[in-house]
Interface confidence: medium
């Protein structure tokens, strides 16, 4: 395995699956240094590519509730407030790390999992495919 | 804390910090159920609120490198390809979970951390404040 300049206070891992299984402190530290980050909660209505938020809940996952964005229109809202189909509303997707209880229903054993979520929508110029 | 119907096969945690400290399997499972998620790699250029990606590196964090979106313009790109300052490019932000080595330099002990990242930008109608 890797040799790291070792802190003498490091815990030992006697787990047979080490180093696949590690100890994680769930006392989550919030590194959002800006104490009042501008919350993007109203952007979903004000955007030219507006979106709705859908609740995705899974009690075996941490975080158990994830809000997913779904673009309201195929096109984008123009200056007149109408949908312009010459432009496209597309979801901005992001992979996030979550914890899944494994085995299921175990309160202190998890597996890291990667899931893809749509965070919001943006308006893009379409890619036009010209047929020869 | 939460009471979970306990699976008899659950590992025990003898850790004095239980249930704050849990075992996590790092063999990351990919739950992207859509077998071909559209990677949004070109949206940052095609958007009417385009963004650049900036590198943020921290060797004590996983993932160690996070590329953050920064909107290119205050305004949005109009149909003529010019910046329209009657509209605003704004970042869409999302909290993500990362793992931090804790204590520092320990290879098998981590703390979950929440950080706010800008995933991309969207074009919004500005909020106009009328001065009386």
């Amino acid at each position: 395995g890797i040799t790291i300049p070792r802190n003498p206070g490091c815990p030992n891992s006697e787990d047979k699956n080490f180093p696949r299984t590690v100890m994680v402190n769930l006392n989550i530290h919030n590194r959002n240094t800006n104490t009042n980050p501008k919350r993007s909660s109203d952007y979903y209505n004000r955007s030219t590519s507006p979106w709705n938020l859908h609740r995705n809940e899974d009690p075996e996952r941490y975080p158990s509730v994830i809000w997913e964005a779904k673009c309201r229109h195929l096109g984008c809202i123009n200056a007149d407030g109408n949908v312009d189909y010459h432009m496209n509303s597309v979801p901005i997707q992001q992979e996030i790390l979550v914890l899944r209880r494994e085995p299921p229903h175990c309160p202190n054993s998890f597996r890291l999992e990667k899931i893809l979520v749509s965070v919001g929508c943006t308006c893009v110029t379409p890619i036009v495919h010209h047929v020869a | 804390g939460i009471t979970i119907p306990r699976n008899p096969g659950c590992p025990n945690s003898e850790d004095k910090n239980f249930p704050r400290t849990v075992m996590v399997n790092l063999n990351i499972h990919n739950r992207n159920t859509n077998t071909n998620p559209k990677r949004s790699s070109d949206y940052y250029n095609r958007s009417t609120s385009p963004w650049n990606l900036h590198r943020n590196e921290d060797p004590e964090r996983y993932p160690s490198v996070i590329w953050e979106a920064k909107c290119r313009h205050l305004g949005c790109i109009n149909a003529d390809g010019n910046v329209d300052y009657h509209m605003n490019s704004v970042p869409i932000q999302q909290e993500i979970l990362v793992l931090r080595r804790e204590p520092p330099h320990c290879p098998n002990s981590f703390r979950l951390e929440k950080i706010l990242v800008s995933v991309g930008c969207t074009c919004v109608t500005p909020i106009v404040h009328h001065v009386a």
Epitope: I4, P19 | L26, Y44, L53, P59, S64, V65, W67, I96
Partner: antibody
Framework: EVQLVQSGAEVKKPGESVKVSCKAS????????ISWVRQAPGQGLEWMGG????????DYAQKFQGRVTITADESTTTAYMELSGLTSDDTAVYYC???????????????????WGQGTTVTVSS | EIVLTQSPDFQSVTPKEKVTITCRAS??????LHWYQQKPDQSPKLLIK???ESISGVPSRFSGSGSGTDFTLTINGLEAEDAGTYYC?????????FGQGTKVDIK
């Protein structure tokens, strides 16, 4: 600029072991993984195994399990690959390659090999 | 293990011509496929990652497409310096595997 510099060519006898090093510079060592890929003369590329530096996780291809040991030393930013029980079939160029642990444009981009070492020729001959 | 099959094995092409190399995976690998170029006596070099994402410093004539099991590397307007062997590589499942390679030479 990221660079991976490997140790020099080796000539070994059958049954011996070889240990190849890969010194990394540029970028945070814990921020990526190192894989080892070999190429026999006139042949294609074959993945042997790799280490995720941040977690110290090592994965090996089944074919090499028990014969190969991959380690890394964060203090010297060097990864090592040791292959034992050498036979003439192990004559090859051995490459180390970097796997980024990056969160790029919304995705965990962790599995492409974005930088490669210059290669180490290992010749096994009696 | 995932088997990657490239075609053709060999291609002889005149400069400025379009080159298409395909890579077929034995099962679905989403977009976890990468393309490398290897010139004689050199290390491989990453050309395209995740099926279609371009790499900084790689000429724009190189592009990739596909998902699931079928992938394509395209060189639009081959140049003399593009001679070499091209490999696909999947990272969806361990062990990582490579295609057998496609050798491209210039007529």
């Amino acid at each position: 600029e990221v660079q991976l510099v490997q140790s020099g060519a080796e000539v070994k006898k059958p049954g011996e072991s070889v240990k190849v090093s890969c010194k990394a510079s540029g970028g945070s060592f814990s921020g990526y993984g190192i894989s080892w890929v070999r190429q026999a003369p006139g042949q294609g590329l074959e993945w042997m195994g790799g280490i995720t530096n941040f977690f110290g996780i090592v994965d090996y291809a089944q074919k090499f399990q028990g014969r190969v040991t991959i380690t890394a030393d964060e203090s010297t930013t060097t990864a090592y690959m040791e292959l034992s029980g050498l036979t003439s079939d192990d004559t090859a160029v051995y490459y180390c390659a970097r796997e980024p642990n990056e969160f790029w444009n919304g995705y965990y981009a962790t599995h492409d090999f974005d930088y490669w070492g210059q290669g180490t020729t290992v010749t096994v001959s009696s | 293990e995932i088997v990657l099959t490239q075609s053709p094995d060999f291609q002889s092409v005149t400069p400025k011509e379009k080159v298409t190399i395909t890579c077929r995976a034995s099962q679905n690998i989403d977009s976890e496929l990468h393309w490398y170029q290897q010139k004689p006596d050199q290390s491989p070099k990453l050309l395209i990652k995740y099926a279609s994402e371009s790499i900084s410093g790689v000429p724009s004539r190189f592009s990739g497409s596909g998902s699931g099991t079928d992938f394509t590397l395209t060189i639009n307007g081959l140049e003399a310096e593009d001679a070499g062997t091209y490999y696909c590589h999947q990272s969806a499942f361990l062990p990582y595997t490579f295609g057998q390679g496609t050798k491209v030479d210039i007529k």
